[in-house]
Interface confidence: medium
């Protein structure tokens, strides 16, 4: 029970974390105008990983989308690799996670298939919740080392137009978002991991053994004695090695011709 | 070299009109943004209105809303101003402005004129 709930808390919390990563990858406002130190206050600036958006405070609001890849900065393309990445990993576990789940049956789904998968889902949660928090701190550290705006001339795809203004940006709301968004889908990550444990089943070290003692064969079997008679005495009281000891599902209810001699 | 040349200046009646044009050259027209801001004698620079690189959005300033009308050429790398029902107060230097968004901050903007001058005197 424990371990369905984990499992399925697992599931839910990953699922909240994946959703938040899409948001945060799609949200504009990854870095916005700092304002408190901008004299011009009617104007409201704030930049995502597609595209740029100004905002007035008379209504008027412009996104215009970066239309080359080859000006923006090294860094904002691997930004967007990273979420990408943690976005496809997040998605292909959950689809995993999906049949994993212990309160779903599919078929005849061993449950130590569904622990692997379950464990499988698992680290990829933990990796897309990595990617996530790695590429929205690269981001952070971009807009804390002051990269972001010093390459103003991103705009390239309308001939790398340069601000006259360098304007100082901040952190935006998709940022913590993204933090929070990878903390959960790591979280889940970890806890499918920790429900893989209680799904695989604790195989056993020995197997079900026959002994067949003289004169009687008789097969003990953990759980109980089971004693079966067999025909006719054993004259000479001699076991062959053969005939001595058989796994549980070789026990017959007949004497074979080497169970006697 | 990037140039932005305004034309169409002069001396006007109140009440009259006037439609002021800035020719582009040197860049992509159609990928920019482009704006008017004046600057009356002694006075700072005041944006009056700007359009976007589509020319799908227009922004304008609230005195010369209803009054003023922004458009933009593409094919032919132009810019124009209709100004209609023109006062003394719009007397100013008008500067065409590029930029990436078709905002009131003159900031955003990476390309300017030289100006045309615009009296509005009887």
């Known amino acids: 029970m424990a371990v369905t709930a984990c499992q399925g808390l697992g599931f839910v919390v990953s699922l909240i974390g994946i959703a938040g990563i899409i948001a945060a990858t799609c949200m504009d406002q990854w870095s916005t105008q700092d304002l408190y130190n901008n004299p011009v206050t009617a104007v409201f600036n704030y930049q995502g990983l597609w595209r740029s958006c100004v905002r007035e405070s008379s209504g008027f609001t412009e996104c215009r989308g970066y239309f080359t890849l080859l000006g923006l900065p090294a860094m904002l393309q691997a930004v967007r690799a990273l979420m990408i990445v943690g976005i496809v990993l997040g998605a292909i576990g959950l689809l995993v996670s999906i049949f994993a789940l212990k309160c779903i049956r599919i078929g005849s789904m061993e449950d130590s298939a569904k622990a692997n998968m379950t464990l499988t889902s698992g680290i990829m949660f933990i990796v897309s919740g990595l990617c996530a928090i790695a590429g929205v701190s690269v981001f952070a550290n971009m807009l804390v080392t002051n990269f972001w705006m010093s390459t103003a001339n991103m705009y390239t795809g309308m001939g790398g137009m340069v601000q006259t203004v360098q304007t100082r940006y901040t952190f935006g709301a998709a940022l913590f978002v993204g933090w929070v968004a990878g903390g959960l889908t790591l979280i889940g990550g970890v806890m499918m991991c920790i429900a893989c444990r209680g799904l695989a089943p604790e195989e056993t070290n020995y197997k079900a053994v026959s002994y067949h003692a003289s004169g009687h064969s008789v097969a003990y079997k953990p759980g109980g004695f089971k004693a079966s008679t067999g025909f006719g005495s054993n004259t000479k009281n001699k076991k062959i090695y053969d005939g001595g000891a058989r796994t549980e599902d070789e026990v017959q209810s007949y004497p074979s011709k080497h169970d006697y001699v | 070299e990037v140039q932005l040349v305004e034309s169409g200046g002069g001396l006007v009646q109140p009440g009259g009109s006037l439609r002021l044009s800035c020719a582009a050259s040197?860049?992509?027209?159609?990928?920019?943004?482009v704006g008017w801001f004046r600057q009356a004698p002694g006075k700072g620079l005041e944006f009056v209105a700007a359009?976007?690189?589509?020319?799908?959005?227009?922004n304008y300033a609230d005195s010369v809303k209803g009054r003023f009308t922004i458009s933009r050429d593409n094919a032919k790398n132009t810019l124009y101003l209709q100004m209609n029902s023109l006062r003394a107060e719009d007397t100013a230097v008008y500067y065409c402005?590029?930029?990436?968004?078709?905002?009131?901050?003159?900031?955003?903007?990476?390309?300017w004129g030289q100006g045309t001058l615009v009296t509005v005197s009887s």
């Open positions: 040197g860049l992509i027209f159609s990928n920019y943004a």
């Open positions: 402005a590029g930029g990436f968004f078709a905002t009131s901050y003159s900031g955003n903007y990476g390309y």
């Open positions: 359009i976007t690189w589509s020319g799908g959005s227009t």
